[in-house]
Interface confidence: low
């Protein structure tokens, strides 16, 4: 009963001229051990002789006849379970059907396996996920329907022709279910990889090129922006004009909206790629950036720090502490907004300049009664001198002096 023969092997095997083919195969013949095995190429049943005709690639019989192909074709199986075969090297004209003619004491069986041998090494196939987004790790898969113990190969990943640094995991399958070589590369694409060519290159053991597959990366990313400002140092004086320009260096998909932000807050009615600031005031100093959005999300440019320079504003004096007790220490602080910061201060006590006092702070370690009075200051920077503020009063408390009776 020929239904007792059960085989498992890949239905079709793929190779190319000069490579080899390893055919994983198992079988079961319930009525006893294998007595004769013949491997045919394109066998055809001859009704007249009740035998199969065809090229005999391998023969293992009781009488020990060995065809000339025996060195190239090897039966690596056994008498009851394993029917694995190897053809090394494999040739173009090996394409077609291999027929495994099995005979036990009472039963015969012809098992057919398809062999597809191409003239040149066929290319692997790169599989990409449906979407690739910047900075999100993806797995690139390169698959080749080939693996053979006698013909080592390697799959090499290239980005724009340069080997990729990321470590790829290569796996092979040489089982009765499947024969393939697979390389998986975990890769976190950056926006700059958009449009770049990824290649999976099939190489022999010496690194010689055999074939390849290429794909163009479609990396979804937020808009990438450059901000340009006139004047280029972004330092202006009050009343000057400033122009900022936003340039989209890359966006995938296309951008949809444009906005400008100052200190993180959106500027109203500023939805073009140029921001014109006329007759700027000091209040317009701050960090500016443009924001352009696409379906992936918003992209922001680097921040430009706009410095609107102005002469010091009217100053105020802060006294720590008033009233002060005679003998205690007191500190005066000159407060004046200015850009750039004041480089020189002039202090006044009761309307008279205090010689040698040019710092922002004045420290008097031991207060005397005559230190009481009005203190004011003037701040100065490269753009001018500020207005002297109203000043502040220092009260000094002290015990009675030179008591006289009247």
């Amino acid at each position: 009963d020929s239904s007792k023969w059960v085989f498992e092997h890949p239905e079709t095997l793929y190779a190319w001229e000069g490579a080899c083919v390893w055919i994983p195969c198992t079988y079961r013949a319930l009525d006893g051990d294998l007595e004769s095995f013949i491997l045919f190429h394109n066998p055809e049943y001859n009704k007249n002789t009740s035998k199969f005709d065809g090229t005999r690639l391998y023969e293992s019989t009781k009488d020990g006849k060995v065809p000339s192909e025996q060195k190239r074709v090897q039966f690596l199986g056994d008498k009851n379970k394993n029917c694995t075969l190897s053809i090394h090297p494999v040739h173009l004209n090996d394409s077609g059907q291999l027929g495994l003619r099995m005979e036990s004491k009472t039963e015969k069986w012809m098992e057919r396996i398809h062999l597809n041998v191409s003239e040149r090494p066929f290319p692997p196939h790169i599989q990409l996920p449906p979407e690739i987004q910047e900075s999100q790790e993806v797995t690139l898969t390169c698959l080749l329907n080939f693996s053979c113990y006698g013909y080592p190969i390697q799959l090499q990943w290239l980005l724009e022709g340069v080997p990729m640094r990321q470590a790829a995991v290569t796996s092979t399958s040489l089982t009765i279910k499947s024969v393939f070589t697979r390389s998986e590369l975990k890769f976190s694409p950056q926006w700059s990889h958009h449009g770049k060519i990824v290649t999976c290159q099939l190489q022999d053991a010496d690194g010689k090129f055999l074939s390849n597959d290429t794909v163009q990366l479609n990396v979804k990313h937020t808009p990438k922006l450059e901000i340009k400002v006139t004047p280029s140092d972004a330092i202006v004086r009050e009343g000057d004009s400033v122009t900022m320009t936003c340039e989209v260096s890359s966006s995938n998909p296309e951008y949809t909206t444009v906005s400008w932000l100052k200190d993180g807050t959106s500027l109203k009615k500023q939805n073009t790629f140029t921001l014109n600031l006329r007759e700027v005031t000091k209040d317009q100093s701050g960090k500016y950036c443009c924001q352009v959005s696409n379906d992936v999300g918003p992209g922001r440019s680097e921040e430009v720090f706009l410095q609107v320079q102005y002469a010091p504003e009217p100053s105020t004096v802060q006294i720590l502490h008033s009233p002060a007790v005679e003998g205690s220490q007191v500190e005066f602080l000159c407060m004046s907004l200015a850009n750039p910061l004041p480089t020189n201060y002039t202090w006044y006590h009761n309307g008279k300049e205090m010689q040698g006092r040019t710092e922002e702070k004045v420290h008097i370690p031991k207060i005397l009664p005559w230190h009481a009075g009005t203190y004011s200051c003037v701040a100065e920077n490269i753009l001018g001198t500020g207005q002297r503020g109203p000043g502040a009063e220092l009260d000094v408390q002290y015990p009675p002096k030179k008591v006289t009776t009247v």
């Epitope: 079709t12 793929y14 597809n116 196939h125 599989q127 990409l128 996920p129 449906p130 979407e131 987004q133 698959l143 329907n145 399958s173 279910k177 499947s178 393939f180 697979r182 794909v215 163009q216 479609n218 979804k220 998909p253 379906d295 992936v296 999300g297």
Partner: antibody
Framework: EVQLVESGGGLVKPGGSLKLSCAAS????????MNWFRQAPEKGLEWVAY????????YYADTVKGRFTISRDNAKNTLFLQMTSLRSNDTAMYYC???????????WGQGTSVTVSS | QLVLTQSSSASFSLGASAKLTCTLS???????IEWYQQQPLKPPKYVME???????STGDGIPDRFSGSSSGADRYLSISNIQPEDEAIYIC?????????????FGGGTKVTVLG
Amino acid sequence: EVQLVESGGGLVKPGGSLKLSCAASGFTFSDYGMNWFRQAPEKGLEWVAYISRGSHTIYYADTVKGRFTISRDNAKNTLFLQMTSLRSNDTAMYYCVRMAGYYAMDYWGQGTSVTVSS
Amino acid sequence: QLVLTQSSSASFSLGASAKLTCTLSSQHSSYIIEWYQQQPLKPPKYVMELKKDGSHSTGDGIPDRFSGSSSGADRYLSISNIQPEDEAIYICGVGDTIKEQFVYVFGGGTKVTVLG
């Protein structure tokens, strides 16, 4: 329980337009890519369009490219298919389908019928 | 070109085991596919995702009588102890992104009839 409910189908003349909607519930809509598929009477299934979670990526079948527009409103858990320049061979049952795993179309709506006829 | 091939129909006796085949085009023999079940006048129902190594994950509400296996370019859907409610068209599907275009193709479907 995951539910996808399509609406907006009907009878339309050739060259006309229709907008299909799909209301999603029972899952976090913004976590999944969504598709439209269709099935003409007595015919096989045909993929129509795909939209990624955040509408970043959109793909169309060649047969509808330039005529159909897929979109989604994650705030309202709704998928749309705007169909214009409709042809008689667009007549089909249109299904809203969630995509998970590798390409697993794991939940299908009951479908909405579109008939294009003069 | 990505192609899936299925036989058009198959009949099985009630309680028997069924094995349906979906064959991938040879250059895509390592792809993951999906199996769907479609009963008359109903939408398709996701049955499972099936990998080259035979590992699979089944959809919600799919009985464990359904299993998957693979051999080369062939992907199998097996139904043990087949029941009348299993009578349906079983369709395999596969997705890929080629260059910049996404494709999702289906096999022609196998109509399963349960006898007895």
